[in-house]
């Protein structure tokens, strides 16, 4: 169905990290252009990326309005130079995306260790609370502000002289772990949202080793 020489988009895919959300699709257009619409279950469709030859559309501004809603996008195909043309049903050819619920599905970006401090047999590791593209009252919210107690972190650590690893968990952005006095440690952190069924964990942060930069702040 649809207009002659116009093909429907396919492989519609959501790419989302820390709520920065882009819809991608195929094919690269030949003599056609695309327009994207996005809606919650309300059916109030909003058009974006009008008559584009790109095969991606940044929908961040729409999904951050309510990250707990479930969204659907659809990609319309039009003949280049004749965007008023429609298919035999009186509508342009289109394809729907999978459903997307940002709060449940956006990937959590790679965390960053902000600082670490050792005092005797205690080591405190602080994870930077990254900003997202979600706004409230005009200001961007951090991951912690968006996810609250749903967000946790896992610390993986070992003595610099050993390969034996240990883990610790926190529901804040800080770890306080017992260490051997005088020993140097290497560690990395991973964000986790235990309540999720998909995209539960981020990638690991870069490994930090004590004694290399003496635990200064890294912003």
């Amino acid at each position: 169905s649809g207009t002659t020489n116009t093909v429907a988009a396919y492989n519609l895919t959501w790419k989302s990290t820390n709520f920065k959300t882009i819809l991608e699709w195929e094919p690269k257009p030949v003599n056609q252009v695309y327009t994207v619409q996005i809606s919650t279950k309300s059916g109030d469709w909003k058009s974006k990326c009008f008559y584009t030859t790109d095969t991606e559309c940044d929908l961040t501004d729409e999904i951050v309005k309510d990250v707990k809603q479930t969204y659907l996008a659809r990609v319309f195909s039009y003949p280049a130079g004749n965007v008023e043309s429609t298919g035999s049903a009186g509508e342009p050819l289109y394809e729907n995306s999978p459903e997307f619920t940002p709060y449940l599905e956006t990937n959590i970006g790679q965390p960053v260790i902000q600082k670490y401090e050792q005092g005797g047999t205690k080591l405190k590791v602080t994870v930077k609370d990254s900003f997202t593209l979600v706004r409230k009252n005009g200001t961007f919210l951090t991951l912690r502000q968006v996810f609250g107690n749903d967000l946790g972190y896992i610390l993986t650590y070992r003595k610099s002289s050993s390969s034996g690893k240990k883990t610790a968990k926190t529901n804040t952005n800080e770890f306080l772990i017992d260490v051997d006095k005088g020993e140097n440690y290497c560690f990395s952190v991973q964000a986790v949202i235990p309540s999720r069924t998909v995209n539960r964990k981020s990638t690991d942060s870069p490994v930090e080793c004590m004694g290399q930069e003496k635990g200064e702040f890294r912003e």
Partner: antibody, heavy 118, light 107 residues
Framework: EVQLLESGGGLVQPGGSLRLSCAAS????????MSWVRQAPGKGLEWVSS????????YYTDSVKGRFTISRDNSKNTLYLQMNSLRAEDTAVYYC???????????WGQGTLVTVSS | DIQMTQSPPSLSASAGDRVTITCRAS??????LAWYQQKPEKAPKSLIY???SLQSGVPSRFSGSGSGTDFTLTISSLQPEDFATYYC?????????FGQGTKLEIK
Amino acid sequence: EVQLLESGGGLVQPGGSLRLSCAASGFTFSNYAMSWVRQAPGKGLEWVSSISGSGDYTYYTDSVKGRFTISRDNSKNTLYLQMNSLRAEDTAVYYCARSPWGYYLDSWGQGTLVTVSS
Amino acid sequence: DIQMTQSPPSLSASAGDRVTITCRASQGISSRLAWYQQKPEKAPKSLIYAASSLQSGVPSRFSGSGSGTDFTLTISSLQPEDFATYYCQQYNSYPYTFGQGTKLEIK
């Protein structure tokens, strides 16, 4: 639990009017498109009309355009169908249904019977 | 308007049988198709949306498949409560249209 309760059906003469209501509960009403579907006695299902969550977008089947008006009051969690210039062929059970994205119909009311007869 | 044609119009089967109902669209509708079950004097109930996605709470013996113009609803092992009338519906474009229904009866 999603609940949809239609009311307002009854017997009306040809050319007359009725207003159907559908009271919704168990979900955030404004977050969903809603639809009316009808079923004539002993017949199949016929989609009649849909409305977006904001009320900004409305759609009708050709046979009711200009005669029926769908509307909603999100503050009252209620969907309406104003039916004017009724005809014998409008006789049916009218169902209200929740319609995610204005697409399929995932929850239905029990229906209200409209009979157009002299 | 897109015409939806179901077959067969009626079907007799026994509990435990595997049953398939087909629905054909007069033009391509991608996967924008839903299936409903209706029992006498009751409101329809949603079974399947997006051609193959099972509605929450619907038993897994129900499944849907197809894309484009040809679709099927399969009940893998009929239960006594499954005897009803089944309808397909396209939501590719307005006006949305239903198939004429398939009445599933006890043999």
